[in-house]
Interface confidence: medium
């Protein structure tokens, strides 16, 4: 999906609101410093694009994340504020559900929510340099 | 698969008030991000507002102040409590679970006086 037309003020403002603090309340317990940031985007696009894959891709040690209130909020805020979005991923959602799996949180998971928060935290600031 | 049934809507006068029922079967509210959106005649669908499972919400600028969406989880039951209701209001009401292709057939809602 090409996240190009989103509108990317109105994904901010969800962020800002809710989404940021369910990706606060995963951490909870966890140090800010305990992960390194290694996954970088480089305008709102490819953040939205990484924070689509990190979001909903399962990964090696982290399988659960997709039906985590952070997750839900996200795929909704991208479907409302990202045209087309939600018909790419009906096919892909209906597949989940009857797969669902159960909520587990891994080290993994942490350090790949880690990532995420970072993601955001850039998706915010469009206008930064690339360190 | 999740079923969604809309109820509530109705005529009704400038500034006044209604409330919007979304009856869910087949799955539970706890597990999902229930939203509302509206279509007016002609115009395309428009995201009203949503409410997490943890009773977190969100609503789009237009309705912010007037509208209040709330769950009731063990009835699987969400809400969308209408005031100060506008002409510009008017439009047929549709919940959805997560936006993902589970939509109610949509209850209509007309602001006439």
């Known amino acids: 999906y090409d996240f190009t037309n989103c509108d990317f003020e109105k994904i901010k403002a969800a962020y800002l609101s809710t989404i940021s603090k369910d990706l606060i309340t995963y951490m909870s317990g966890t140090k800010s410093t305990e992960f390194n940031n290694t996954v970088s985007c480089s305008n709102r696009p490819h953040c939205l694009t990484e924070i689509q894959s990190l979001t909903f891709n399962p990964t090696a040690g982290c399988a659960s994340l997709a039906k985590e209130m952070f997750a839900m909020k996200t795929k909704a805020a991208l479907a409302i504020w990202c045209p087309g979005y939600s018909e790419t991923q009906i096919n892909a959602t209906q597949a989940m559900k009857k797969r669902r799996k159960r909520k587990v949180t891994t080290n993994k998971c942490l350090e790949q929510v880690s990532q995420l928060q970072g993601l955001w935290r850039r998706f915010n600031r469009p206008l930064l340099k690339q360190q | 698969e999740v079923q969604l049934v809309e109820s509530g809507g109705g005529l009704v006068q400038p500034g006044g008030s209604l409330r919007l029922s979304c009856a869910a079967s087949?799955?539970?509210?706890?597990?999902?991000?229930m939203g509302w959106f509206r279509q007016a005649p002609g115009k395309e669908r428009e995201f009203v507002g949503f409410?997490?499972?943890?009773?977190?919400?969100l609503y789009a600028d237009s309705v912010k102040g007037r509208f209040t969406i709330s769950a009731d989880n063990s009835k699987n039951t969400a809400y969308l409590q209408m005031n100060s209701l506008k002409p510009e209001d008017t439009a047929v009401y549709y919940c959805?679970?997560?936006?993902?292709?589970?939509w109610g057939q949509g209850t209509l809602v007309t602001v006439s006086s």
């Open positions: 409410i997490g499972s943890d009773g977190s919400t």
């Open positions: 959805t679970t997560e936006w993902d292709g589970y």
């Open positions: 087949g799955g539970t509210l706890d597990d999902y991000v």
